[in-house]
Structures are given as structure tokens and as C-alpha cells.
């Protein structure tokens, strides 16, 4: 064919351009080409001929007739992506083609499932929560909005933002609470992520924070702690960084800690610790108890002889720790512990709160108060410093040794020895079963060191002997029984005093209470047979004219007496035992005071009580032997006053081996009671009976003592 | 129009290998992933894996993986699939398919019948 | 792996019949499921494509429904030439299931 002057090559005056489109959309590349004669068209794709209905008929690829390539919907797979790629598109005449740009066909695509869905948040209110979300794969590349409770959320919020997938509210409140929804899109559409669900907690606070507190021992006290927070905070409290110790404490429904009667140890920081699943918040308070004054070892009246040093101790204990002074009764002048001595002054003041004068006049007689001082209270006590040349109160008479128990045959002599000793010099005579004895049997004589003599025995004989050794100072008495049988011997053992144990040392006393005084000793000298037991007996002028057993059996060189009388002076001795019999007495003790009677109960006026308890009038009537080994004792009151708690019943046992033992009690707790049954006595023994009116220590005067003898045998009836 | 043609029936005896062809026309070639399917005689359809005659990229499900190995020429727009060590329990009708851009064969072979037997 | 269990394994029927054959997966295979006919000595084809959509050519008796574990292909009215094997298959990992004969009764 020949050319003709007005033909030319292909030229492309519009080429493709790039375009994402939608799988399953319409698409079309356009190409524009000039050229004579009029230029066809091909297009390829990544260098490969693409077939249109040109080709197939059934082809979904439409070659139009501007050149353009139209797609009546773009077919792309998961792996076959028949449409995706570079295409071109070649305009060709017989002068020659022309080749347009490259422009790319990319498939929009927006995948079902999300790289990361949004997962459920707990957070505290006002802490910033963070959702976050990447979209399904995509291209173009999905972007995201959110939706809360399925309305889309306005990130101009100040405290919202959305940055790459993720959601951030800054400072959460409650009303944040809701269902979250991650949302994909891009030109193929949107894809909605599981929902999530954001928890706006409340981190627990107070509403009332426990507040420290400042009490007295035994008052109640309660550290309140008020928490709100959702959900609900459990609440728990500890002391001192630990678990609170069992018992002590009560927790109420409004979580408030009570302590119903504080104790010292309860001292200390208490912490109220609230917590739920966003937080924990603690708030403490301490608590300090304040503990009146207490007196550990309180002073004790004293006798003492002039020129010599007393000692009056003085200790106490508290919260905070008193402070100590003493005072003389009648005294402006204090002394104070570590105060430099005053010239000529004999009084100071230990740091331990112990008042010591030296060189006693008489003129430092009189009472000595010590006070302790706190915030939390002052108590007193007082002490009376008694100053002597002699001690006037002498004892009755001391009965070195007294007759034994024994059995002897019918016929034979016995012998009951009674040696006695005093100022003035006692008086020997004898009782049998309570009655003057010997009267004018010609069988019994008393000789010179007051030994009883009783030849030619008779069975009825048998009995309860008693020496009494008396004096203008008083009297003592101790008791034997004598069994005379059969089958006995014929005439008394005579104990040498090598066969019985040496005396004990002279008692020291170390301690005083109200009821009590404690004594310690030290066995007979060496080379004297050893102690098995001691007893120990004590005498006071005010309780009676005469020592009393107040100890029996006692295995120990250190013994606290008890069942003592309140502000009363006493004397004590100690003797020791063997299988032989007693030694002789030890050397007496220094005179003790027992403690003075503590103040009363709150609302109760010592005196009030102390007069109406030494007006009361009990009269003892005669005990009933109910069985062998059971005593009936019933009494009246002349007036029944308002202050009596109860009858102390006390009884004593003074025939038989323990003639003369300590005093026992059974208390009748019942003010309107008027009777009561001594019980486990024992058989054929005789009983010193007594009763004592008491108000808590308060004790009233005793009644005339009563004495009963039980019976072997069951009584006839 | 578009269509796969396979090529004749095998007779092979166990431990040997098969290669079966599978030409396609009507269709630019390596815009669609081809699949090999087989089914034994009496049973169902097995898929055995498939090809991208792009680039060549083959997948397999565990069971063929080390026997089966698939190729292509794109200049005769042909794909193949190779079996090796045979068993009689390989004895099937061997088919080629196209995988549309639906995710789905649209277009199959007439099927290749490889007989395994000593 | 994810299986695909096809029920029933084989079913008769009438001409004009209503025929449901249910496919299900082990795990969600969203709308990834295809159906396909074939006839004795025949290759399959292709008639329904992502759950629900009919290939071009194939008669509209033929439906597909179902997403996520549980499809089913229903012929509406069955005809004499509907009379062979239909298979379900996964997109996703390709695996076809067992298979259902339907037989003139």
C-alpha cells in the first residue's frame, strides 16, 4: 500500500490512569488514540495480551470503541486475580504504534476478620482507658471510627482521641461505661469488630477516715471508716502492718473497728485498708492509751525503832509513766526522785519512786504519802512509819514444845510435855476435851516444866488433851489426842530435841498486801536434822490473844500468807517438821502492817460502808452435825445494813493432828442468806466455827466463835 | 471459549510416577490459579493442591506434600502435575481446575484416569 | 484443618421434589462455600459460589444459603436431569465434603 501525505502514526492522547476499584464493580481504563488511519487497539496486561469480548463473547472485559477498556465487574479471588495488575494500552496503524503509560488496576479489598479485635477494659474512674483495634486487612488501607453503644463517637471531644487504631479517653468517668465497636472501612465498605465493653470502676475513697484517739484503759473506743467505690470495696483493718489479733476487736456492718475495753497493748496504728479491683486506698489513725497510775509494789506501814533507816518502796505503772512524789501528811514539802539532797535532810527520793529516811526520830512518825501523777489520772497511798524504843506489843506466850499424839496400852503412863516461854514468864495448865483437867484424880499431875503425868490408864483416858500457856500478854494453846487401847504402849516416847529439826532463821518479810504478807526464811543451823515441812504461825493483838496456825505443810523457805486482816499488825514464826515431831519456833518476825483497805468501787463511799459493815451484829448459833463429816452453821443479823455482799463462814479445825490450822472460808454470796452446810470435815475432830460479814474487800466485824465437835459415826436418829 | 484439556489415560505400576498436562486456552493463563482434584473410583473429590502460573507458588495439603509437585510453562499456557511413588490406592481420575476470581472452579478438565496396578 | 460434613450421604426423591442438602464446618468459614454437580463419568460443575450466588448458566431452582458453620443448597423442583452427586467445598482450605447421591425414588 502506498502512503498517503495525510496519514500518521498512532499517538495516545489519553492514557490510562491508576484506579482502585471495588471487587465485583465497574470499572474502565480509558485510552484515546490519534492517527491515520484510525489507529486499533490492544491492551496488556503485565505484558500479557488481555482477552475482551472481542476474544469471548462471554468475556466480562468490554473493549470499547474509544479504545477504552471497561470492566463490567472486576473479578478478584482470594488467590485467582484475574483483573489485578499493569496495564497498557498499544494504538497501531500501518505507520507504526503507540504505547500509553503504565496505569495499574488495584482491587479494593476489605477482609472480614479484624488483626485485633477491641477486648473488654476495666478501668478506675478519671485514669485514661485505652481500646484498641486493628481493622481487617484492606486495600486501600481501612481506616477506623469507633462507636459507643452503636452511635459513632466524636473524637473532638478533648478527652477522646483516635490515633492508629487505637481509642483514648484521657480521664474516664462513669458515663464512659458502654459497648465499644471498632469500625473498618475504606471504598469496599465497613466492617463492624466484636463489641467490647469498657468498665468505668470507682478506685475506693473515704468518706469518713478513721481519726486518732486518745483513751484511758478499759473505755471504749471505735475508729470509724466510711469508703464508697464501685464495686463495692471490701474493707479490712490491720495494727501495726499485721492482721489484727482474734478476740479483741469487733467489726461492725458499717466497718467501724471497736475496741470495747482498750488495754495497753492496744496501743498503737490502726489502718483501714479499702479495696475493690481498680484500687486500694489505706488511711490510718493511731490510738494511744492512757493508763491511770497503778501501783506495782505500794508502801507498807512500818515499825521501827529510832536512829535506824526506813525504806518505804513505791512503784508504779502507767501510760504515760507517772511521776512520783512523796509527802508527809500535814507537810507542804514534796520530794521529788533525783532532787538534790537539802542539807540536814534525811528523806530522799530514789529514781525508782522509793522514799528512805535515815536515822529515824521520833518525830518522823506519821503518815508518808506517796502520789503518782499522769495525764491520765494521780493515785495515793499511804504509810505509816511507826517509830519505837521496844516494841510494846508483846506476844502472847510462845510454847516451845507441846504435847504429841500417841497410843498407849491400858495400865501404862503417859506423859504430854508442854515447855513454854514468854514475857512475863506463862502460866502451864491443862484442858481435856475443853474442861479444866486434872482436877482431883490422883492418877494426873502437872510437874515443873508443865509436863502432864497421867499414870495407871484407863480406856477412858481417850481424849483431846490441851496446854494452855498463859500470860497477861495472852495465851497459846496446842493440842494432843491420847488414845489409850489394849494393845499400846505401855509409856510415852520422850522425844529428845536431837530428833527433831533446829529452828528455822527469824522470818523476813518481803512482801505486804491488804490480806497477805509474804515471808522467807532460811532451815535450822547445819549440823541439825533437815526440815520436811514447815508451819508458820501468827499472832496479832487485834485479831486475838493467842498465835494461830496459819500455814501447814508448807515445803517451800518463801510463803505467802493470806486471809490476813486489812491495816493490821502482825508477828510471825516458823517451825519445821520432821517424822519426829516440831523444832522449836524460829526467832520472831519484825512487826508488819498489812495494807490499808484500797479505796472503793466508784459511787460507793468507803466510810459509808466500812460504818454500816462495823455495825452489823451477827450472832452464831450453835452448828448441827448433820453427818460424820457435814456441819450445819446458821446465824441472824441484828440489822441488815445496805452494803453486804454476803457471810464469810470461817472454820478451823483444833483437835487432832492440825489443831489450830488456818482459818478456811466458804462464802455465803447471798445477802439475805442465814445459813450454811460445812462440807468434807473430818471425822471425830473438833471445829472452831466463826462468821464474817463483806462488802467487796470491805469486812465487818466477826461473830462469837462456836466450836463442834464431828462424829465417828453416822448420829442416831 | 474458554476451556482445560488433559492429557490420555496412564497404566502405572506402584513405586512409579505419573505426569499428567493440563492445557488451558480461551483465557489469559496466568491471571487464575489452577487445582488438581482427584477421585478414586467409587469415592469423592480430593483436592491436591494448586499452582499460581504467575509465578510458580504451589501449595499442597499435608497428605500429598513430598509426592506431589506441580509446574507450569506459560509460553504453552500448560500446567502440570506430577505423582510420585505410587500405590494402587492412587488409581483415580486426575482433574485440572481453574479457580475463578469467586474463589471457585469454574472451569475443569475432562478428567485423566492414572490406573496403578502390577 | 477445617472438615466439612455433608448430609445426607445419599437421599431418594420425585421429580417436582423439594431437595435440601446441608453442609456444615468444623469452624466458621463465613461465606467461603461453593456447591458443585456431577454426573457418573463427568467433571463437576460449578453451581452455586460463595454461599449463595448462582454461576452464570446454571437454572435458578438451584439456591445456596447459609454463613459461618452451617449451609445448605436447595433444589426447588427437582427435574430428571438434576438426578446426581452434589458436592459442598470450603474457599478458605479447599477441602470438598463426602458428597450426596440423589436417586429417583
Known amino acids: 500500500s502506498r502512503l498517503r501525505q495525510e496519514d500518521f502514526p498512532p499517538r495516545i492522547v489519553e492514557h490510562p490512569s491508576d484506579v482502585i476499584v471495588s471487587k465485583g464493580e465497574p470499572t474502565t481504563l480509558n485510552c484515546k488514540a490519534e492517527g491515520r488511519p484510525t489507529p486499533t487497539i490492544e491492551w496488556y496486561k503485565d505484558g500479557e495480551r488481555v482477552e475482551t469480548d472481542k476474544d469471548d463473547p462471554r468475556s466480562h472485559r468490554m473493549l470499547l470503541p474509544s479504545g477504552s477498556l471497561f470492566f463490567l465487574r472486576i473479578v478478584h479471588g482470594r488467590r485467582s486475580k484475574p483483573d489485578e495488575g499493569s496495564y497498557v494500552c498499544v494504538a497501531r496503524n500501518y505507520l507504526g504504534e503507540a504505547v500509553s503509560r503504565n496505569a495499574s488496576l488495584e482491587v479494593a479489598l476489605l477482609r472480614d476478620d479484624f488483626r485485633q479485635n477491641p477486648t473488654d477494659v476495666v478501668v478506675a474512674a478519671g485514669e485514661p482507658a485505652i481500646l484498641e483495634c486493628q481493622p481487617p486487612r484492606g486495600h486501600p488501607e481501612p481506616t477506623i471510627y469507633w462507636k459507643k453503644d452503636k452511635v459513632r463517637i466524636d473524637d473532638k471531644e478533648e478527652r477522646i482521641s483516635i490515633r492508629g487504631g487505637k481509642l483514648m479517653i484521657s480521664n474516664t468517668r462513669k458515663s464512659d461505661a458502654g459497648m465499644y465497636t471498632c469500625v473498618g472501612t475504606n471504598m469496599v465498605g465497613e466492617r463492624d469488630s466484636d463489641p467490647a465493653e469498657l468498665t468505668v470502676f470507682e478506685r475506693p475513697t473515704f468518706l469518713r477516715r478513721p481519726i486518732n484517739q486518745v483513751v484511758l484503759e478499759e473505755e471504749a473506743v471505735e475508729f470509724r471508716c466510711q469508703v464508697q467505690g464501685d464495686p463495692q470495696p471490701t474493707v479490712r483493718w490491720k495494727k501495726d502492718d499485721a492482721d489484727l489479733p482474734r478476740g479483741r476487736y469487733d467489726i461492725k456492718d458499717d466497718y467501724t473497728l471497736r475496741i470495747k475495753k482498750t488495754m495497753s497493748t492496744d496501743e498503737g496504728t490502726y489502718m483501714c485498708i479499702a479495696e475493690n479491683r481498680v484500687g486500694k486506698m489505706e488511711a490510718s489513725a493511731t490510738l494511744t492509751v492512757r493508763a491511770p497510775p497503778q501501783f506495782v509494789v505500794r508502801p507498807r506501814d512500818q515499825i521501827v525503832a529510832q536512829g535506824r533507816t526506813v525504806t518505804f518502796p513505791c512503784e508504779t505503772k502507767g501510760n504515760p509513766q507517772p511521776a512520783v512524789f512523796w509527802q508527809k501528811e500535814g507537810s507542804q514539802n514534796l520530794l521529788f526522785p533525783n532532787q538534790p539532797q537539802q542539807p540536814n535532810s534525811r528523806c530522799s527520793v530514789s529514781p525508782t519512786g522509793d522514799l528512805t529516811i535515815t536515822n529515824i526520830q521520833r518525830s518522823d512518825a506519821g503518815y508518808y504519802i506517796c502520789q503518782a501523777l499522769t495525764v491520765a489520772g494521780s493515785i495515793l497511798a499511804k504509810a505509816q512509819l511507826e517509830v519505837t524504843d521496844v516494841l510494846t506489843d508483846r506476844p502472847p506466850p510462845i510454847i516451845l514444845q507441846g504435847p504429841a499424839n500417841q497410843t498407849l496400852a491400858v495400865d501404862g503412863t503417859a506423859l504430854l510435855k508442854c515447855k513454854a516461854t514468854g514475857d512475863p514468864l506463862p502460866v502451864i495448865s491443862w484442858l481435856k476435851e475443853g474442861f479444866t483437867f486434872p482436877g482431883r484424880d490422883p492418877r494426873a499431875t502437872i510437874q515443873e516444866q508443865g509436863t502432864l503425868q497421867i499414870k495407871n490408864l484407863r480406856i477412858s483416858d481417850t481424849g483431846t488433851y490441851t496446854c494452855v500457856a498463859t500470860s497477861s500478854s495472852g495465851e497459846t494453846s496446842w493440842s494432843a489426842v491420847l488414845d489409850v487401847t489394849e494393845s499400846g504402849a505401855t509409856i510415852s516416847k520422850n522425844y529428845d530435841l536431837s530428833d527433831l529439826p533446829g529452828p528455822p532463821s527469824k522470818p523476813q518479810v518481803t512482801d505486804v498486801t491488804k490480806n497477805s504478807v509474804t515471808l522467807s526464811w532460811q532451815p535450822g543451823t547445819p549440823g541439825t536434822l533437815p526440815a520436811s515441812a514447815y508451819i508458820i504461825e501468827a499472832f496479832s493483838q487485834s485479831v486475838s490473844n493467842s498465835w494461830q496456825t496459819v500455814a501447814n505443810h508448807v515445803k517451800t523457805t518463801l510463803y505467802t500468807v493470806r486471809g490476813l486482816r486489812p491495816n493490821t499488825i502482825y508477828l510471825f514464826m516458823v517451825r519445821a517438821i520432821n517424822p519426829q515431831g516440831l523444832s522449836d519456833p524460829s526467832p520472831m518476825s519484825d512487826p508488819v502492817r498489812t495494807q490499808d483497805i484500797s479505796p472503793p468501787a466508784q459511787g460507793v463511799d468507803h466510810r459509808q460502808v466500812q460504818k454500816e459493815l462495823g455495825d452489823v451484829l451477827v450472832r452464831l448459833h450453835n452448828p448441827v452435825v448433820l453427818t460424820p463429816t457435814t456441819v450445819q452453821v446458821t446465824w441472824t443479823v441484828d440489822r441488815q445494813p445496805q452494803f453486804i455482799q454476803g457471810y464469810r463462814v470461817m472454820y478451823r479445825q483444833t483437835s487432832g493432828l492440825q489443831a489450830t490450822s488456818s482459818w478456811q472460808n466458804l462464802d455465803a454470796k447471798v445477802p439475805t442468806e442465814r445459813s450454811a452446810v460445812l462440807v468434807n470435815l473430818k471425822k471425830g475432830v473438833t471445829y472452831e466455827i466463826k462468821v464474817r460479814p463483806y462488802f467487796n474487800e470491805f469486812q465487818g466485824m466477826d461473830s462469837e466463835s462456836k466450836t463442834v465437835r464431828t462424829t465417828e459415826e453416822a448420829p442416831s436418829a | 471459549q474458554v476451556q482445560l484439556v488433559q492429557s490420555g489415560a496412564e497404566v502405572k505400576k506402584p513405586g512409579a510416577s505419573v505426569k499428567v498436562s493440563c492445557k488451558a486456552s480461551g483465557y489469559t493463563f496466568t491471571g487464575y490459579y489452577m487445582h488438581w482434584v482427584r477421585q478414586a473410583p467409587g469415592q469423592g473429590l480430593e483436592w491436591m493442591g494448586w499452582?499460581?502460573?504467575?509465578?510458580?507458588?504451589?501449595e499442597f495439603p499435608q497428605k500429598f506434600q513430598g509426592r506431589v509437585t506441580m509446574t507450569r510453562d506459560t509460553s504453552i499456557s500448560t500446567a502440570y502435575m506430577d505423582l510420585s511413588r505410587l500405590r494402587s490406592d492412587d488409581t483415580a481420575v486426575y482433574y485440572c481446575?481453574?479457580?475463578?476470581?469467586?474463589?471457585?472452579?469454574?472451569?475443569w478438565g475432562q478428567g485423566t484416569m492414572v490406573t496403578v496396578s502390577s | 484443618d477445617i472438615q466439612m460434613t455433608q448430609s445426607p450421604s445419599s437421599l431418594s426423591a420425585s421429580v417436582g421434589d423439594r431437595v435440601t442438602i446441608t453442609c456444615r464446618a468444623s469452624q466458621s468459614i463465613s461465606s467461603y462455600l461453593n456447591w458443585y454437580q456431577q454426573k457418573p463419568g463427568k467433571a463437576p460443575k460449578l453451581l452455586i459460589y460463595?454461599?449463595?450466588s448462582l454461576q452464570s448458566g446454571v437454572p435458578s431452582r438451584f439456591s445456596g444459603s447459609g454463613s459461618g458453620t452451617d449451609f445448605t443448597l436447595t433444589i426447588s423442583s427437582l427435574q430428571p436431569e438434576d438426578f446426581a452427586t452434589y458436592y459442598c467445598q470450603q474457599s478458605v482450605g479447599l477441602f470438598f465434603g463426602g458428597g450426596t447421591k440423589v436417586e429417583i425414588k
Open positions: 460463595a454461599a449463595s
Open positions: 499452582i499460581n502460573p504467575k509465578n510458580g507458588d504451589t
Open positions: 481446575a481453574r479457580e475463578s476470581g469467586d474463589d471457585a472452579f469454574d472451569i
